[in-house]
């Protein structure tokens, strides 16, 4: 132990400690609860949740989606490929979660919690992943210009973008949860 430091071990009692899989599962469910809270405000504030004009806004977005080739579905399931996809997807969602930070009035704290808990989930998954080389981190410059572009949209498009981000993130996490339960 370095000087000026004092390391104190916490010993495990008789109960079973949380496993990596259990804790990741709980973390995803934590984020999903956060998304539900945010969606509640979004849907109460505007009629975006019932809107049929989603395609207009979706053209501006390149939100991560699970595809057959990612190996996360029951048919053609591949643990390594899927884990890489989940981590890569979460890293890609980070810029959109940053965009959400100024989009909520009464749920500002919840929006921050969703953003931070996603960062924590990435940490947990990166420890679980063996093939870290295959994980590409989004380019900060590209993210910065995307953020500027999203923030420059008119009010209706910003509301629609918020709705689409939350919906897509929820779907991505639900797919991830199902896949991780097979690992």
């Amino acid at each position: 132990v370095p000087p000026g430091e004092d390391s104190k071990d916490v010993a495990a009692p008789h109960r079973q400690p949380l496993t990596s899989s259990e804790r990741i599962d709980k973390q995803i469910r934590y984020i999903l609860d956060g998304i539900s809270a945010l969606r509640k405000e979004t849907c109460n504030k505007s009629n975006m949740c019932e809107s049929s004009k989603e395609a207009l806004a979706e053209n501006n977005l390149n939100l991560p989606k699970m595809a057959e080739k990612d190996g996360c579905f029951q048919s053609g399931f591949n643990e390594e490929t899927c884990l890489v996809k989940i981590i890569t997807g979460l890293l890609e969602f980070e810029v959109y979660l940053e965009y959400l930070q100024n989009r909520f009035e009464s749920s500002e704290e919840q929006a921050r919690a969703v953003q931070m808990s996603t960062k924590v989930l990435i940490q947990f998954l990166q420890k679980k992943a063996k093939n870290l080389d295959a994980i590409t981190t989004p380019d900060p410059t590209t993210n910065a210009s995307l953020l500027t572009k999203l923030q420059a949209q008119n009010q209706w498009l910003q509301d629609m973008t918020t709705h689409l981000i939350l919906r897509s993130f929820k779907e991505f996490l639900q797919s991830s949860l199902r896949a991780l339960r097979q690992m």
Epitope: V10, A11, A12, P13, R15, P17, L18, S20, R23, K26, Q27, Y30, D33, G34, A37, Q110, R112, A113, M116, S117, K119, V120, Q123, F124, K127
Partner: nanobody, 124 residues
């Protein structure tokens, strides 16, 4: 463990776990001064990294996580004689429900695991 520090000095306490991963748990730091009740001074959640500090240590103490080492540290600066006591770290899962109250982390929340404590003495 712990140590003798002069007033105004600094000390860093580090909490590690044996038999489980501390990364997955909310961690609180508590202290017990001679003849006094144990008091919660700081905590950090595992779910969204929210932190809390008791008024007595706010601005002087900093709690942080290190995922590489799976530890939680308490950096204590500008130490005062009244900071003297036995310091304990504890780990729990009270932060796993969205909307938990961070300020309750040093009081009403349950902790599953407790460290054995280390003596910190601030004196000239």
């Amino acid at each position: 463990g712990g140590g003798l520090v002069q007033p105004g000095g600094s000390l860093r306490l580090s909490c590690a776990a044996s038999g489980f991963t501390l990364d997955y748990y909310a961690v609180g730091w508590f202290r017990q001064a001679p003849g006094k009740e144990r008091e919660g001074i700081s905590c950090i959640s595992s779910s969204d990294l929210k932190t809390y500090y008791a008024d007595s240590v706010k601005g002087r103490f900093t709690i942080s996580r290190d995922y590489a080492k799976s530890t939680v540290s308490l950096q204590m600066n500008s130490l005062k004689p009244e900071d003297t006591g036995v310091y304990y770290c504890a780990a729990g899962t009270w932060d796993l429900k969205f909307g938990y109250n961070i300020s309750a982390c040093v009081g009403s929340y349950e902790y599953d695991y407790w460290g054995q404590g280390t003596q910190v003495t601030v004196s000239s």
